[in-house]
């Protein structure tokens, strides 16, 4: 429905709270660079433009799109050129091309620093002096370092950040009480932003199709009582949300993100028995549970897939009037059937599906030619099965941090070109899928693991695709979405890679590692090992325990000496030398 | 909005040959499946013919096979049946029609569709 206003429609829907946070994020996910007062100011300019035009949508400038308005806006910033550089051709061009451009100078890994945690009476301080602006501060930090965060999410994560403030400000030990919420709300959010991150990745890299598909599988997995054309409505709607968020409509995308909430609530008895708590949570909540929400129960006595798929008649028939919408229907009644599958893997048995569906039903005897097509599954479907279960064996054997260091070797012989930083930060994440899933009984294992993976490998890929430095790493990025595990997987060591030379300073350490948390410690180890693998590729698992075992003892030997500078140098010295010989280097 | 024009009927002797277009628009021809659905005198709806989006899959009913053939030009947006070797049950009106989100496929009620072209065969 079209309004003479766009921004006064969104700033009537949203209530200016919502408008002002939602526009705080969006400039901040443009300008990852721009101060907290440059962005605050914007907003400010923003939101008095758009109550100007509730007041009269008349009014002049009202009717503008509101990637006009706020091109326009950001285009005003002036050390555009010098902080951002080749970004501020973007303002020469026009609607749509000047957000494509914005867009595409979106940058996944900013050159921001680390975000220190102050002392909590200094956070309770700031939050008690102004807590609009202590708010407004969070989302401008995540925002900015996770310039595809999710914003309706965001806002549900700036809302328990400021209930934690609110109760843990008055506790009488605030630390206890704020520390663990914070250090909560820091890993959600992460994870948050991943899982964000390759929706977006599935959109811009792969198209709408392959989206949509993915969201067919997930949504019927998760809601296998409801019907193919009540799925297929979820999708679309769903489909929607992603695409504004993704491509920075984010007043549009929260909009419609209520809306589906809303229409998600007013039909669970069609959707899901499982939705009763969620609907009754306050909107962001409500968006937060309905998006978190169990699988239901799958009906009793399903028929077998067999029956319209394989055995019918009409399978070409049915398949040549409508593809993607028959392709839609298997994967849809393939996924209800099967929440003990990943969604990648599901996704894979749809395109078997489908290439057999080509193959076949071009041919002289269609049925004679595709009855078989069931079998091809297995193979798919025991591959997942079998690689999880020897890494969860090999995770309970080692525990997280082995297990992520024994990741950290396997992916630096694959793909040694990628930097040290990403590496560590990829296989470390990489690792936690041991803790995060192999808990779980069999049923939850592959949905849990693979498409938890396909999230990591995703950071990967965005973070290769910054500088790209591997052949390989491109190849499994981007020849198929729901193949990149198995193509990293069956990656073995890279033979064309020319070890980096030696250099005593990447070994080389001081005493401010043992003031480091244990987390900072393992990553400075981690950073070794990656360090020691790319010069000696290859290094035998026992050569590289060996030196690791010296190297976490010559640690714990320094951090306990009296003069630990002193120790640092002359043991760290004699420890290069003896790893040097242990390796061969 | 979606618009099907069937054109091409008339009548003809047993034996004969018709050949039907269909003109679409209002929608994207080229990614779309198309058929040919019939309706004889106080009869319902028999599904004739299927041709999907780039020609490689073809179906046709039992009952004209061999006789027709569906085909298409994505270029002009049009949906062909050549009807070879008529016969007096071929006397129906002929529609073509595509997929409607939403709706069942082969549930042709649910489809887009023309107003239909009448073929008569009567010696």
């Known amino acids: 429905d079209a309004h003479k206003s766009e921004v006064a429609h969104r700033f009537k829907d949203l209530g200016e709270e919502n408008f002002k946070a939602l526009v705080l994020i969006a400039f901040a996910q443009y300008l990852q660079q721009c101060p907290f007062e440059d962005h605050v100011k914007l907003v400010n300019e923003v939101t008095e433009f758009a109550k100007t035009c509730v007041a009269d949508e008349s009014a002049e400038n009202c009717d503008k799109s509101l990637h006009t308005l706020f091109g326009d806006k950001l285009c005003t910033v002036a050390t555009l050129r010098e902080t951002y550089g080749e970004m501020a051709d973007c303002c020469a061009k026009q609607e749509p091309e000047r957000n494509e451009c914005f867009l595409q100078h979106k940058d996944d890994n900013p050159n921001l620093p680390r975000l220190v945690r102050p002392e909590v009476d200094v956070m309770c301080t700031a939050f008690h002096d102004n807590e609009e602006t202590f708010l407004k501060k969070y989302l401008y930090e995540i925002a900015r370092r996770h310039p595809y965060f999710y914003a309706p999410e965001l806002l549900f994560f700036a809302k328990r950040y400021k209930a934690a403030f609110t109760e843990c400000c008055q506790a009488a030990d605030k630390a206890a009480c704020l520390l663990p919420k914070l250090d909560e709300l820091r890993d959600e959010g992460k994870a948050s932003s991943a899982k964000q991150r390759l929706k977006c990745a599935s959109l811009q890299k792969f198209g709408e199709r392959a989206f949509k598909a993915w969201a067919v599988a997930r949504l019927s997995q998760r809601f296998p009582k409801a019907e193919f054309a009540e799925v297929s409505k979820l999708v679309t709607d769903l489909t929607k949300v992603h695409t504004e968020c993704c491509h920075g409509d984010l007043l549009e995308c929260a909009d419609d993100r209520a809306d589906l909430a809303k229409y998600i609530c007013e039909n669970q008895d069609s959707i899901s028995s499982k939705l009763k708590e969620c609907c009754e949570k306050p909107l962001l909540e409500k968006s937060h549970c309905i998006a978190e929400v169990e699988n239901d129960e799958m009906p009793a006595d399903l028929p077998s897939l067999a029956a319209d798929f394989v055995e019918s008649k009409d399978v070409c028939k049915n398949y040549a009037e409508a593809k993607d919408v028959f392709l839609g229907m298997f994967l849809y009644e393939y996924a209800r059937r099967h929440p003990d599958y990943s969604v990648v893997l599901l996704l894979r048995l749809a395109k078997t599906y489908e290439t057999t569906l080509e193959k076949c039903c071009a041919a002289a005897d269609p049925h004679e030619c595709y009855a078989k097509v069931f079998d091809e599954f297995k193979p798919l479907v025991e591959e997942p099965q079998n690689l999880i279960k020897q890494n969860c064996e090999l995770f309970e054997q080692l525990g997280e941090y082995k297990f992520q260091n024994a990741l950290l070797v396997r992916y630096t012989k694959k793909v040694p070109q990628v930097s040290t930083p990403t590496l560590v930060e990829v296989s470390r994440n990489l690792g936690k899928v041991g803790s995060k899933c192999c808990k779980h009984p069999e049923a939850k294992r592959m949905p849990c693991a693979e498409d938890y993976l396909s999230v990591v490998l995703n950071q990967l890929c965005v973070l290769h695709e910054k500088t790209p430095v591997s052949d390989r790493v491109t190849k499994c990025c981007t020849e198929s979405l729901v193949n990149r595990r198995p193509c990293f997987s069956a990656l073995e060591v890279d033979e064309t890679y020319v070890p980096k030379e030696f250099n005593a300073e990447t070994f080389t350490f001081h005493a401010d590692i043992c003031t480091l948390s244990e987390k900072e410690r393992q990553i400075k180890k981690q950073t070794a090992l990656v360090e020691l693998v790319k010069h000696k590729p290859k290094a035998t698992k026992e050569q590289l325990k060996a030196v690791m075992d010296d190297f976490a003892a010559f640690v714990e030997k320094c951090c306990k000496a009296d003069d630990k500078e002193t120790c640092f140098a002359e043991e760290g010295k004699k420890l290069v030398a003896a790893s040097q010989a242990a390796l061969g280097l | 909005e979606v618009q099907l024009v069937e054109s091409g009927g008339g009548e003809v002797q047993p034996g004969g040959s018709l050949r039907l277009s269909c003109a679409a628009s209002?929608?994207?021809?080229?990614?779309?499946?198309m058929v040919w659905v019939r309706q004889a005198p106080g009869k319902g709806l028999e599904w004739v013919s299927t041709i999907s989006d780039d020609a490689r899959i073809i179906r046709y009913a039992e009952s004209v096979k061999g006789r027709f053939t569906i085909s298409r030009d994505n270029a002009k947006n049009t949906l062909y049946l050549q009807m070879n070797s008529l016969r007096a049950e071929d006397t129906a009106v002929y529609y073509c029609?595509?997929?409607?989100?939403?709706?069942?496929?082969?549930?042709?009620?649910?489809?887009?569709w023309g107003q239909g072209t009448l073929v008569t065969v009567k010696p």
């Open positions: 209002g929608f994207a021809f080229s990614t779309s499946g």
């Open positions: 029609a595509t997929y409607r989100a939403g709706s069942r496929i082969g549930s042709y009620e649910d489809y887009y």
